[in-house]
């Protein structure tokens, strides 16, 4: 039967090295044996490169293309082929459709004054675009009650969070994650961090007396 | 050590076809635009073609498209110009010339960083 | 298509000065920061021409640097310190952003 798609690629960049793109067939496909994603940078000279599609589900595929460095003026026109059929053709300009990386190695230690130091990595290289642009969101979740959670927005420059001990349950296992997202290009959300747990021995000052 | 040596270069009527070569060599062929420039005697330079590394896309000037067919034939490392209804104003030394590295996403531009000695055609009756 | 303009079309130069040549081009030759897509050629008489700056600024193998070039956008210029004699010759802009790529008009320079 005739191959046919289902939900149009769907397109986003870390703006530093890769575009994933998605897309939903209309029925069951192996993607990497049906089809191929062909991406080409308007740009004079560029050449077509090709992308083999992977199985996200048994009809949405998902194709991870390696692109270089990105500036804000490229774009690239995207085909996608089944066969010699054209399914789909259209452009993508990754500064406009921006996914952050996820940021990394988010670690809880003890600090003066009970409180916990979160800390994590800045995804980009400082010479990228998206290092000073970053903002993040860190979820902090109680392991054993799932009504106690709490949302914190970092709106400044360094990846840390301090938080103090007694905002939080004593002797309850507390997980921590992290995502980012560049406001100056109106990017989606990264990706959540993998989550850090530690268990809040802070005694409250009334078991003191 | 780089090379580009053009050939083909000759006298022809008004109307008729040439075909000019380029034989690369000393430098990754297939990894280059390679351009065509011409220089109308007494004149200054004229961009008049250009193809990428693996051939795939090509590029004109006004004042040859539809009669020039530029082309590459990476496995002898040779750059071709296909000119067809020549006119008198096509009469021009013509140089190719190594353009932009096409083999990454963003072609890696070094302007026109090598040239050839240039082939002359005539067309006159 | 890109117009290209050069001024002077023609500049005599003792040895030992510096002799400046602009270009001028109709729209914007920046891709991206750092990035103008806008070189200077020298043609000596009887040769082929030969690559002396790229992207604007930045010097092609083998030239020396007494050759500089600055500018963005649409306004470039080529600066030659402490002229030689060898530096008679036809000099060209060029911009390699888009199709069709455009020469400037040539100056000729001449060493007195």
């Known amino acids: 039967g005739s191959v046919k798609v289902l939900h149009e690629p769907s397109c986003f960049s870390d703006y530093i090295s890769t575009s994933v793109c998605q897309w939903k067939m209309d029925h069951p496909t192996n993607c990497s044996a049906e089809l191929r994603l062909s991406y080409q940078l308007d740009f004079m000279g560029s050449e077509n490169h090709t992308c083999v599609p992977e199985n996200r589900e048994d009809s949405v595929c998902v194709c991870s293309m390696p692109i270089d460095d990105a500036v804000e003026a490229d774009v690239y026109q995207l085909d996608l082929w089944a066969g010699q059929q054209l399914l789909w053709s259209g452009s993508f300009q990754p500064s406009k459709h921006v996914k952050p990386r996820t940021p990394g190695n988010l670690t809880v230690h003890p600090n003066i004054s009970h409180t916990w130091l979160l800390m994590w990595t800045n995804p980009y290289p400082t010479e990228n675009h998206l290092h000073s642009e970053l903002t993040y969101m860190v979820n902090v979740s109680n392991d054993n009650d799932p009504e106690d959670f709490k949302v914190y927005n970092v709106t400044y420059m360094g990846p840390t969070l301090r938080l103090a001990a007694s905002t939080l349950k004593s002797g309850a296992s507390y997980s921590a994650r992290v995502r980012a997202w560049a406001q100056t290009y109106n990017s989606t959300w990264s990706d959540w961090s993998p989550s850090t747990t530690w268990l809040n021995y802070y005694e409250p000052w009334e078991q003191h007396l | 050590e780089v090379q580009l040596v053009e050939s083909g270069g000759d006298l022809v009527k008004p109307g008729g076809s040439l075909r000019l070569s380029c034989v690369a060599s000393?430098?990754?062929?297939?990894?280059?635009?390679m351009t065509w420039v011409r220089q109308a005697p007494g004149k200054g330079l004229q961009w008049v073609s250009l193809?990428?590394?693996?051939?795939?896309?090509?590029y004109y000037a006004d004042a040859v498209k539809g009669r020039f067919t530029i082309s590459r034939d990476n496995a002898k490392n040779t750059l071709y110009l296909q000119m067809n209804s020549l006119r008198a104003e096509d009469t021009a030394v013509y140089y190719c010339?190594?353009?932009?590295?096409?083999?990454?996403?963003?072609?890696?531009?070094?302007?026109?960083?090598?040239w050839g000695q240039g082939t002359l055609v005539t067309v006159s009756s | 298509d890109i117009v290209m303009t050069q001024t002077p079309l023609s500049l005599s130069v003792s040895p030992g000065e510096t002799a400046s040549i602009s270009c001028r081009s109709s729209q914007s030759l920046t891709y991206s920061i750092g990035y103008n897509y806008l070189d200077w050629y020298l043609q000596k008489p009887g040769q082929s021409p030969q690559g002396l700056i790229y992207?604007?600024?930045k010097r092609a193998s083998g030239v020396p640097d007494r050759f500089s070039g600055s500018g963005s956008g649409t306004d470039f210029t080529l600066r030659i310190s402490r002229v030689e004699a060898n530096d008679t010759g036809v000099y060209y802009c060029?911009?390699?952003?888009?199709?069709?790529?455009?020469f400037g008009q040539g100056t000729k320079l001449e060493i007195k």
């Open positions: 000393g430098f990754t062929f297939r990894d280059y635009a």
């Open positions: 193809i990428n590394g693996s051939g795939g896309k090509t």
């Open positions: 060029m911009q390699g952003l888009q199709s069709p790529l455009g």
């Open positions: 010339a190594v353009d932009r590295k096409t083999k990454t996403i963003r072609p890696q531009y070094y302007g026109l960083w090598h």
């Open positions: 992207l604007g600024h």
